[in-house]
């Protein structure tokens, strides 16, 4: 004797997040009379998705006209799919009963898998700046993707990095997944303009990976090199002492002139020049009136860079001798000057 069968022809359906899923179901008979219901999951905890007979299911539409008397197509469409909709859906035929309808036969189920794009990778560097030759860690995070398979690569200025560790969570089955990766990068003095890139490839991205970037300019601190030199000026009783501050980054820098250990003047780097590698140069001038001094003068250029402990360079100014050139300005890039007289 013939008996109604519930056919769900698709074992699995793969849908991109935000799209509409079509779950197909047909019955092979109009007998027995009774409604169809759709559930996600099986057993006592199953979730009602659609009831042909009653209820309000705003995300669900029927493919065929449900009021058509000879309708055997119980396919439904679920709109605006999210990863949370993933699961196995069952089309279940009920036999009309009193007081309640009785479950008669279920389809074999259709597994709905949701393809969700990963979020844009967010790359974050260390909290504090580090100096060249130090190794710093960068993290990259991306969330909300499905299925679990994903590829993550690190690059520094287009060169692929190999020193990194990646985890995809959770380890077991989930509606969506997250990836977390930590890469180690050795800084060099030339890294002010460098970029670290985290690249994520996933089936939903159709060969066009997502990238997150971090500029090493936010991570690196290149300490300055100091050079103090003395040049004569036309007036025989005056000497020009310059402090060349070279190759520093970031720009935040404060310079103090000390005369025999006593603060003479403090100034902040303003009109700096930028080098091709992104570092800065600055020069401060000090015009010394030699005739005002009986003894030799020790001039110190003290620089505090980016809140770090001060570094200094000293120059001994001989007042007994006739002023003559004791050094030369070798930094062609230096154009800025600060002129002061000491009397």
């Amino acid at each position: 004797e013939e008996e109604l069968q519930v056919i769900q022809p698709d074992k699995s359906v793969l849908v991109a997040a935000g799209e509409t899923a079509t779950l197909r179901c047909t019955a092979t008979s109009l007998i027995p009379v009774g409604p169809i219901q759709w559930f996600r999951g099986a057993g006592p905890g199953r979730e009602l998705i659609y009831n042909q007979k009653e209820g309000h299911f705003p995300r669900v539409t029927t493919v065929s006209e449900p009021t058509k008397r000879n309708n055997m197509d119980f396919s439904i469409r679920i709109g605006n799919i999210t990863p949370a909709d993933a699961g196995t859906y069952y089309c279940v035929k009920f036999r009309k009963g009193s007081p309640d309808d009785v479950e008669f036969k279920s389809g074999a189920g259709t597994e709905l898998s949701v393809r969700a794009k990963p979020s844009a990778p967010v790359v974050s560097g260390p909290a504090a700046r580090a100096t060249p030759q130090h190794t710093v860690s960068f993290t990259c995070e991306s969330h909300g993707f499905s299925p679990r398979d994903i590829t993550l690569k690190w690059f520094k200025n287009g060169n692929e990095l190999s020193d990194f560790q990646t985890n995809v969570d959770p380890v077991g089955e989930s509606v969506s997944y997250s990836i977390h990766s930590t890469a180690k990068v050795v800084l060099t003095r030339e890294d002010v303009h460098s970029q670290v890139i985290c690249e994520v490839a996933h089936v939903t991205l159709q060969g066009d990976p997502l990238r997150g970037t971090a500029n090493l300019s936010e991570t690196i601190r290149v300490p300055p090199t100091l050079e103090v030199t003395q040049q004569p000026v036309r007036a025989e009783n005056q000497v020009n002492v310059t402090c060349q501050v070279r190759k520093f980054y970031p720009q935040r820098l404060q310079l103090t002139w000390l005369e025999n250990g006593n603060v003479s003047r403090t100034e902040t780097a303003s009109t700096v020049t930028e080098n091709k590698d992104g570092t800065y140069n600055w020069m401060s001038w000090l015009l010394v009136n030699v005739s005002a001094h009986r003894d030799d003068v020790k001039l110190t250029c003290q620089v505090e860079h980016d809140g770090q402990p001060a570094v200094s360079k000293s120059h001994d100014l001989k007042v007994s001798a006739h002023p003559k050139e004791q050094g030369s300005n070798t930094a062609a890039e230096n154009t800025g000057s600060n002129e002061r007289n000491i009397y």
């Epitope: 109604l4 197909r24 493919v63 006209e65 058509k68 008397r69 197509d73």
Partner: antibody
Amino acid sequence: QVQLQESGPGLVKPSQTLSLTCTVSGGSISSGSPYWSWIRQHPGKGLEWIGYIYASGFTYYNPSLKSRVTISVDTSKNQFSLKLSSVTAADTAVYYCAREGYHSGMDVWGQGTTVTVSS
Amino acid sequence: DIQMTQSPSSLSASVGDRVTITCQASQDISNYLNWYQQKPGKAPKLLIYDASNLATGVPSRFSGSGSGTDFTFTISSLQPEDIATYYCQQFAYLPWTFGGGTKVEIK
């Protein structure tokens, strides 16, 4: 007023595939919820239902022909098609396409096309 | 498959006669039954759906009845244009199946 028109070769060689198309005019193939069926009638015999396709793209084929039948729909051309593979002389028949509308029953039929399987 | 047994396979009646055709299903099909008329060289035409409902444009001399396994199709007053073969078809179970047909002729 919906009308159906079958088209395809009248002669097919044994072991080849019979291909027929039903063109729907006077209405959209995708509107409403009709079942689009193929039926055949052997010379001097009764009617045999081959199978149908409907809105969701779901097909159901008569088990007696299932392994050889494919019914498909092309909504852009407002057509549905029948393919029957590995034909023999026993597949010689008049082939009809039909629509089952909102009410039960195939209320619109094509005029039928005769297909002869012969070498 | 549901077997549909139609009888008689042919009959001859006079114009104005009442003609009755029966159709028996191999199991209960409720009232999921249709009746078709097919004239020579033509496609079938739906006359009755859901066992007893007259299709659009069909003369009222045609009627149908029955439920479960036994069904009857009646032409209350046979007309010359009714010469045709009549088929029952069940749609309660897939695959849909037809009866063998009843050929109606005029005496």
